[in-house]
Structure formats: C-alpha cells, structure tokens
C-alpha cells in the first residue's frame, strides 16, 4: 500500500522536510503532489512525468518545493502555514491512480532565551533569587539546569509561570553556580547563556588553629606563637586580632616570637563580611609557663555570633 | 616602623625590561601582601598586581599579563617587579604599598615610588 | 573590571568651608571603598578604608559615607594643609581600580 512518510514529522520554521513516498506501484507513469488531504486542481504543487522527467508546478507551488523521480518532495525554508496535509497521486498505465496523505507540522523557531534575575548576590538565609527565562513564546516547553544538571528536588526550589520562572527560596551557599534556561518545542530546542549566581555568605563561626614552634603541645616562655584563623565566607572575610580587647593587625595569622608570661590572655579572631553585614569571632585563652608546666591552650575556647 | 624601600630611578629604552625592589622593614613580611601601583606623569593611580610573600602567589592585572613577572626574597624581605617589552607609556612613578590586612583591604603603607623613564 | 568615577575632577574651596567628593562604582561594592590623599610631590596615604572607617591619626574633620555603589568623602572644614588629590578605590578583590582623582584646592 502507497505510504507517505514526513521526515522530519515536526519542522521548525525555516527548515526543510522531506516527504517520501513508500510502495510506489510498479507501474507508474506519473506523480502529483497536492496540498491538503484530497485531490483537487486548485490545490495542485507540482506534477511530474516520468518518461520525459519533466515537473510542472500547479496553482499551489510557491518556488521553495522540488520533486524528485522517487516521487519524494522536498519543501524548503518552510512556514507555519505549510504545516498540515499532502496528498501524493500516482498516475499508473492502466489510469487506475493511488493516492496516499501524509502531514507534517511546522514550529516556529526558537529565539535563544536569555535569564533575569532579580538578584545575583543573595545573601544566603536572607535572600530569595528569582530567575526568569525570557522570552514568553507559546506552545513552548521551559527546562532549567544548574552547573549543567537538571534542576534537584528541592522544597526552596519552586517553578511557576509555566516553569519561565524559577524561584530559590531563602538561598544557600550551595546554590551558587551556573543557571541556563532552555526552550523546547517539538522540533527545536534553544539554551540561554549561564548566568552565575554568587551567593554571599559567612562569615562563619572562625577557628583558631595553633602552631607551635617548637612544635610541641605547650606553651613554654621562649617559644614562638603562630596562630591562624580560619572563617568560611564570601566574599572572604576581613581579619583582625585582639589581645586583651586592644587592637592588634588585621591579618590571617598571628605571630609572637618569643612568647613570655606577659603574653598570657585572651586572643580573639573577629571576622566581618561588608556584603553579607555579618561579623563573627573566637576568643582563646592562652597561658605561657616560665618553665617546666605546660598548659597550652585553655579549653574553654568560645565563640561569639554577631549579626 | 613599618618601612618600604623602593631601587632608584631607572632609564630604559622601548622593547627593554626593567626590575624594580622593594625592601619591607618593622613587621613580618610574609604576613602581608604587597601590591603595585603606577602613577604616569599627572595621571592618576594604576593597579598592577600584588604578590603573597608567603606562598608566592600572584595576581596580575589583565593589561600587564604577560608582561610583568612579582617575585619574592624571604631572605631579605624583598619583592621584585618586572615589567618587559617596554614604551613609551610605561614611563611612571612605581610604587609597592602593603595591604593593610589579609583579603579586601585597602594599601595602608607605600614605598617612596621609583621612576622609571621609557625613552630611546 | 569595576570602574570607578569620582567628581568633580577638581574643585576650589575657601579654608573652612565644607567639601565633597563622590565615587561611584559600576557595581555594587558593599562598602568596600578607600580614600587616599595624595600631596603634590608625595606618596599616596590612606585616610579611610570600609567606606567610613578612619584609620588612626588621620583629621576627624575627614570622613566617609555611601553604600553600594554611591559613596562621598567629606572635610568638614578644609584646611591650608588639605590641598591634594584624593582618590577612591575598591578594596573588593582584585583587580583593585581607582577613581581618576579629586584636585583639591585653596581659593
């Protein structure tokens, strides 16, 4: 039986497809090809001989169709007005023609979306960051990928307005990365550039690691303090020290050669971040034995959490 | 107190290099990064990148990459900065300047600046 | 890279009058702004640094304000001494960027 198979069966806009014609009778003379679902002369694209391979086109030939001697038509830089059904007749020697319909569905072609957003330095726990992926076109499908992924399941993750929006409730440091939209019909798909989202977070409780050198575990007079803290923020925290509460540098590491009695305190790490307006510190006590005794670092280190 | 002394004046001609010092004194050199600046004649005040003395890392403002080399001499407090290919528009005053802590501080202390002259 | 422009380039005041001198950024700066003073002939100093902090020994009669990308150095009532160019800059990572400088002078 006479078949019409559309390759592609969705076309985007300006594109072309292919229909071919499958089982063609042995004893054909001729091919015409019409728009619609019927044979009708108005509706007529273009008939072909084959004894003299010769194609005529018809009242609906619009220039952009090509008939081929395997009866397949080519239609070129098609429109959503091509889309719907064609009817391939093939004329046989003995005047009984076949005829078969196919159809094909034309989709307009996709803009490349681009994002939105509302905020792309949320500060975490504080923030929610809306992301819409622009523009609005119908009978379009919107996916979302992060760093390259498809979206988690997460409940602070919410999509609406026919998934062109995607909303990250009270983010965290973990959602930061890379977001693309992308837009998707039938037969075409287009992805936007990444849009980075920085999520600014900490400064958070900071620790306080010793180095002794020596390096053994107590706090001997004579021995040289290396204290380093450490906070985890973004952007990276300001450093700076307190020895019994007066000020002292604003650096990462504290050090003192040469470490006596004198030097026994509390020594606090504070840490601020201007973009998240968070402040944290740590305080520790340290004693420094004259001799033989070693206390090190007291215990009861503690911190204290500003906002 | 805090000092940062800077190599004198240099005169280069276009296509040459040129190496500038500069010597930190009164506090711990590895603790804190030291940038460098230029200031052409009556211009103002130009990033060019700064050095970790600790670590030896560095970060280069995108017009001098690939041109200026920071190093370092924890043996004697020194920072180095090398500019190569040199013309006419290098001619500046340099200046080292110590950030006045660790990460996104401002320049709190600054050598005395060496003026290097591009001129054939 | 984040721009930086000051105004007015230059100004003429009277010895203790008021004066201002903006900054603005091109992106959100979070505070993270300095000012220097540069005396004819001198090396750059630092006067305020985290947009409003003064470092120590610098005049009480300068001082900082602004948030985000907006910010202003002000003398409360210039003097003889104050005659200089005056920079800002971002201290949020790098690459740091400079204003093009404030001249300030004595009418």
């Known amino acids: 039986k006479l078949t019409i198979e559309s390759t592609p069966f969705n076309v985007a806009e300006g594109k072309e497809v292919l229909l071919l014609a499958h089982n063609l009778p042995q004893n054909r003379i001729g091919y015409s090809w019409y728009k619609g679902e019927r044979v009708d002369g108005n509706s007529l694209i273009v008939g072909y001989v084959i004894g003299t391979q010769q194609a005529t086109p018809g009242p609906a030939y619009s220039g952009r169709e090509t008939i081929y001697p395997n009866a397949s038509l080519l239609i070129q830089n098609v429109t959503q007005n091509d889309t719907g059904f064609y009817t391939l007749q093939v004329i046989k020697s003995d005047l009984v023609n076949e005829e078969a319909t196919g159809q094909f569905h034309v989709y307009p072609e996709l803009p490349k979306p681009s994002i939105s957003s509302n905020n792309s330095n949320p500060v975490e726990d504080k923030d929610a960051v809306a992301f819409t992926c622009e523009p609005e076109v119908q009978n379009t499908t919107y996916l979302w990928w992060v760093n390259g992924q498809s979206l988690p399941v997460s409940p602070r993750l919410q999509l609406s307005n026919g998934n062109m929006t995607l909303t990250l409730l009270s983010v965290k440091r973990n959602d930061a990365g890379s977001y693309e939209c992308e837009i998707q019909n039938p037969a075409s798909a287009n992805r936007s550039d990444p849009v980075t989202l920085n999520v600014l977070y900490g400064p958070d409780v900071p620790t306080i690691s010793p180095i002794i050198s020596p390096p053994d575990s107590s706090y001997l007079s004579g021995a040289n303090l290396n204290l380093s803290c450490h906070s985890a923020s973004n952007p990276s925290p300001q450093y700076s020290w307190r020895i019994n509460g007066i000020p002292q540098q604003h650096t990462q590491v504290l050090f003192i050669a040469k470490i006596t009695p004198n030097n026994n305190g509390t020594y606090a790490c504070f840490v601020s971040n201007l973009a998240t307006g968070r402040n944290n510190s740590i305080v520790k006590s340290i004693t420094v034995s004259a001799s033989g005794t070693s206390p090190g670092l007291s215990a009861g280190a503690h911190h204290h959490h500003h906002h | 107190q805090v000092q940062l002394v800077q190599s004198g004046a240099e005169v280069k001609k276009p296509g040459a290099s040129v190496k500038v010092s500069c010597k930190a004194s009164g506090y711990i050199f590895t603790s804190y990064w030291l940038h460098w600046v230029r200031q052409a004649p009556g211009q103002g005040l130009e990033w060019i990148g700064y050095i970790n003395p600790q670590t030896g890392y560095t970060s280069y403002a995108q017009k001098f990459q690939g041109r200026v080399t920071m190093t370092r001499d924890t043996s004697t407090s020194t920072v180095y900065m090398e500019l190569s290919s040199l013309r006419s528009e290098d001619t500046a005053v340099y200046y080292c300047a110590r950030e006045y802590g660790n990460y996104n501080y401002p320049l709190d202390y600054w050598g005395q600046g060496t003026l290097v002259t591009v001129s054939s | 890279d984040i721009q930086m422009t000051q105004s007015p380039s230059s100004l003429s005041a009277s010895v203790g009058d008021r004066v201002t001198i903006t900054c603005r950024a091109s992106?959100?700066?979070?505070?993270?702004l300095a000012w220097y003073q540069q005396k004819p002939g001198k090396v750059p100093k630092l006067l305020i640094y985290n947009f409003k902090n003064l470092v120590e020994g610098v005049p009480s009669r300068f001082s900082g304000s602004g948030s985000g990308t907006d910010f202003t150095l002000t003398i409360s009532s210039l003097q003889p001494e104050d005659v200089a160019t005056y920079y800002c800059?971002?201290?949020?990572?790098?690459?740091?960027?400079f204003g093009q400088g404030t001249k300030v002078e004595i009418k």
């Open positions: 992106e959100n700066q979070y505070g993270y």
């Open positions: 800059q971002h201290h949020l990572g790098t690459p740091y960027t």
